[in-house]
């Protein structure tokens, strides 16, 4: 007798846990932005505080009734959804409304810029506990609320938002597309994209994780003791706030990174149907539903790492697209992918005091994306090393020479254009452990790192057969911080992280007219942190 | 995540001396116009002007009242609904498109942007 | 079968805390489609809805007697309790414990009180 | 709160005749309301839930229709064991009860 959403996202191991802790006395307060709210619903009464924040635009239409009940529907489900007594994901957290959506569900962008300075005030007058706000809502992309979240999500506030009910790309709308916010899709009962009508949940490489948005049970704003289900991405953000709420509410301490580390970390992974997507946007996409995760006292010393991808480069002969990690972050590797296969490669270089990871479109490509490979590594210390290209028919070498550094990923940047340079199969016989080896013409990028019980090895899985991919995993205990398609492949697209899964692709064409000896390899750099341990590379 | 997606950015042409005005002339705007994509989100008529991150309280106020005075001088009245100050240093204002050029070269300016709606998901 | 069956002392003394348990029988109180609540009727007057709880023991109560109400519950008795502090001679009623729906499974049925016990008459006196 | 008021206080029927109860609320209750019966030195017992909908086990006679602040309970034919207190009560805010109509044989 549980709701198929609370079965979903909460581990059984929770559940009993949250039968002890009826109302928890939790210090977290969540700011929902939304509709007005029925505060004496049963659900929430006692837990909601209505602030006299009202910045809404006006009804539209002559006719049209405002009726409280109907006025107070969608922000009263998503309090429901936060913090309910009985259906909610955080039950007993303190939540705050803040009235951006007047009775239509519409708002604007100054009213929510308006409502986080509020929250930012109230933080200021008032320092309380961790602030989690949610963001039921959604618009066009909007480069100062995507600011504005930046600058909140500074102060330490955790900012969720809804990936938008559009069936497009997340990217294309705001505070969705924000790199500080938490942005959750919608799936249904069934772990699959939710369809609304001739929409849907949104995609893309601006969502963090899905989460149960269709068919929700929650508190109603027809009376007192009501429950409508409602669906939606602003139902599957808030499944994510409520379980933000909870991680916090246990460890108080835990950033805006470690948050998003641990949420992607134990989500429940590969279980959506990608072809819901387009598919130029399903490897951009998540494949993961949000499932509360245990404490740091229960699975500490993990390495946690995330893919991020970058914004597609455009055509043009010289694009570059850029990938950057959250501050708290270290990049440790960077790879590129290009549907056409024409790319010039990836390299990761500093601007503004931060490493991002960089990749560049050839001549005659469609375009390229960065892929950064971005973790959480308490007290690192990682620099990059690089060497110019080699001479024709000569490899480039790169290794960590620091001491008790250790080599977490390498990338590749062709200066030459002719990309028939770099089919001649390269000699990797030579091939040190803890080296990167470079194809031929191209400069060489290694990422070495130094933390306390860091250390790192090398796994290779190649196919000389026909094959669109070639894949290596790190197995259990490791985490993948670099993946490559290491040299002497014939044309691939690159090389990218799903999850601990590196994968290297390859061109279409070139698997007709590629010699069986000469192997696509997937190269993938795993490494564990063991605190106890000094830095090290496995052989 | 944070390129501009599929956004409207517009430079507008600006006359290089308005109204004969050396202090207005003095400053020549680098500062963009933004709004969004989608035509029937757009508010026109109102507008967030964004300031540089640097720009201090007083000179928040201060460009804002220097909008009034030179909108005031040209025959517009314009409305400063709110004040930002801290989250980002800017303001709201209600005022009529052809002002945007001007404002666009108020010193401490970094962007406009549009006022647009947003929906509940 | 559900039943329910109040028990607590009959009288009860002005400015004294009126203490009542409901026993649960036939089916576990826990359960995220129920609450469990206490309803009162004075003599030949109507019916008052006094407060709910679930079996986490989340709470609700009536607010004109919120300041003085408290029940609670225990999972591994399958009971819940009822106390009212400061009775005056208005308490004096017959108090009846009731099932309620959550409204949280749709399928445990309508949003409204049934099994009801089959009541407690206390009368405040001195 | 939201105040129920019942009427008639007492409805003197014979068996076979149709009894018809009213309640009316001090403001909309939408729909959320429900009908009791309670015979004596028993508890009550839900007939009509949700305005119109008979709960499980009631007999067709019983009917219940409204929306809003005004409601009738029906009772088609009297039958004796239906002589009893009928209590009207909403759910849209908390929960309150009506005053009471009782149905006593003529």
């Known amino acids: 007798s549980i709701p198929w959403n609370l079965e979903r996202i909460i581990p059984a191991w929770h559940q009993t846990e949250e039968d002890r802790s009826p109302d928890g006395s939790s210090q977290v307060e969540v700011y929902l932005l939304d509709t007005s709210i029925q505060g004496a619903h049963r659900e929430i009464e006692g837990r909601v505080t209505i602030t006299d924040f009202n910045s809404v635009p006006e009804e539209d239409g002559t006719r049209f009734h405002r009726q409280a009940s109907k006025c107070d529907s969608h922000g009263t489900h998503l309090a429901g959804v936060v913090s309910g007594r009985d259906a909610g994901v955080a039950k007993g957290t303190s939540l705050h409304s803040l009235r951006v959506l007047n009775c239509q569900g519409k708002g604007t962008v100054s009213g929510t810029l308006i409502g986080l300075e509020f929250i930012r005030k109230s933080q200021l007058i008032q320092p309380s506990g961790p602030l989690v706000v949610l963001l039921p809502l959604a618009g066009g992309y909007s480069r100062i609320l995507n600011a504005a979240c930046r600058h909140l999500a500074r102060t330490g506030v955790v900012l969720v938002a809804a990936a938008g009910n559009f069936r497009d790309d997340a990217c294309l709308y705001s505070p969705a597309s924000a790199p500080e916010v938490i942005t959750v899709g919608a799936t249904n009962a069934q772990d699959q994209p939710v369809t609304l009508g001739t929409l849907g949940t949104n995609f893309g490489r601006c969502v963090d994780l899905f989460a149960p948005g269709k068919d929700i049970i929650g508190a109603s704003s027809d009376c007192s003791t009501c429950f409508m289900s409602q669906s939606g991405t602003s139902q599957a953000a808030a499944h994510v706030a409520g379980i933000v709420a909870r991680m916090l509410s246990r460890e108080p301490t835990l950033t805006l990174a470690e948050l998003r580390q641990r949420l992607i970390h134990f989500s429940t992974k590969d279980v959506i149907n990608m072809a819901w997507f387009p598919e130029d946007q399903q490897v951009l996409t998540p494949n993961l539903v949000a499932t509360l995760p245990p404490s740091t006292h229960e699975t500490g010393g993990q390495l946690l790492c995330r893919t991020v991808w970058s914004a597609h480069s455009g055509p043009t002969r010289t694009a570059t697209a850029t990938a950057r990690c959250a501050p708290e972050e270290e990049l440790l590797s960077c790879s590129s992918f290009s549907r056409s296969g024409r790319r010039r490669g990836d390299w990761i270089e500093a601007i503004g005091g931060q490493q991002v990871c960089k990749a560049l479109n050839a001549f005659g490509g469609e375009g390229v994306y960065a892929v950064a490979r971005c973790c959480l590594v308490p007290r690192a210390n990682c620099s990059i090393h690089n060497t110019p290209a080699a001479r024709a028919g000569l490899e480039t070498h790169v290794h960590c020479h620091q001491k008790d550094h250790v080599l977490t990923g390498c990338s590749f940047h062709w200066e030459v254009e002719d990309l028939s340079v770099r089919r001649q199969p390269a000699l990797r016989s030579r091939r040190q452990p803890g080296q990167c080896v470079g194809h031929q013409a191209a400069s060489v990028y290694a990422s070495c790192c130094h933390a306390p019980g860091l250390e790192c090895k090398i796994k290779e899985h190649g196919i000389s057969g026909p094959s669109e991919q070639v894949t290596v995993a790190c197995e259990a205990g490791w985490t993948l911080t670099g993946c490559n398609v290491l040299p002497g492949a014939s044309l691939t697209l690159g090389a990218y992280s799903v999850d601990n899964l590196c994968v290297a692709r390859v061109h279409d064409t070139a698997r007709a007219d590629r010699t069986s000896g000469e192997a696509t390899v997937a190269a993938a750099i795993c490494c564990r942190s063991r605190p106890s341990a000094k830095a090290s590379w496995v052989q | 995540q944070d390129e501009d997606g599929d956004y409207e950015e517009l430079m507008l042409a600006l006359p290089s001396q308005e109204d004969g005005l050396a202090d207005e002339a003095a400053h020549v705007a680098t500062a963009t116009f933004r709004r969004c994509s989608k035509e029937a989100w757009r508010l026109p008529g109102t507008y967030i002007v964004v300031l540089m991150e640097e720009t201090q309280r007083l000179q928040i106020e201060q460009t804002a009242h220097r909008l009034q005075t030179r909108a005031a001088r040209r025959g517009y009245v314009i409305k400063v609904l709110h004040i930002f100050y801290d989250l980002f240093p800017g303001f709201l204002v209600k005022m009529s498109s052809d002002l945007l050029g001007l404002a666009l070269k108020l010193p401490h300016v970094e962007y406009i942007e549009e006022d647009s709606f947003v929906f509940a998901q | 079968q559900l039943q329910l069956q109040e028990s607590g002392p009959g009288l009860v003394k002005p400015s004294e805390t009126l203490s009542l348990t409901c026993t649960v029988s036939?089916?576990?109180?826990?359960?995220?489609?129920?609450?469990w609540g206490w309803i009162r009727q004075p003599p030949g007057k109507g019916l008052e809805w006094i407060g709910s709880i679930n079996y986490r023991g989340s709470t609700y109560y009536n607010p004109s007697l919120k300041s003085r109400v408290t029940i609670s519950v225990d999972t591994s008795k399958n009971q819940f309790s009822l106390k009212l502090s400061s009775v005056t001679a208005a308490d004096t009623a017959v108090y009846y414990c009731?099932?309620?729906?959550?409204?949280?499974?749709?399928?445990?049925?309508?949003?409204?009180?049934?099994?009801w016990g089959q009541g407690t008459l206390v009368t405040v006196s001195s | 709160e939201i105040v129920l008021t019942q009427s008639p206080a007492t409805l003197s029927l014979s068996p076979g005749e149709r009894a018809t109860l009213s309640c009316r609320a001090s403001?909309?209750?939408?729909?959320?309301l429900a009908w009791y019966q309670q015979k004596p030195g028993q508890a009550p017992r839900l007939l009509i839930y949700?305005?119109?909908n008979r709960a499980t086990g009631i007999p067709a006679r019983f009917s219940g229709s409204g929306s809003g602040t005004d409601f009738t309970l029906t009772i088609s034919s009297l039958e004796p064991e239906d002589f009893a207190v009928y209590y009207c009560?909403?759910?849209?805010?908390?929960?309150?009860f009506g005053g009471g109509t009782k149905v006593e044989i003529k």
């Open positions: 036939g089916g576990s109180i826990r359960s995220s489609a129920y609450y």
């Open positions: 403001q909309s209750v939408s729909s959320y």
């Open positions: 009731a099932r309620e729906n959550s409204g949280v499974v749709p399928a445990a049925g309508p949003n409204w009180f049934g099994p």
């Open positions: 009560q909403q759910r849209r805010n908390w929960f309150t």
């Open positions: 949700d305005a119109s």
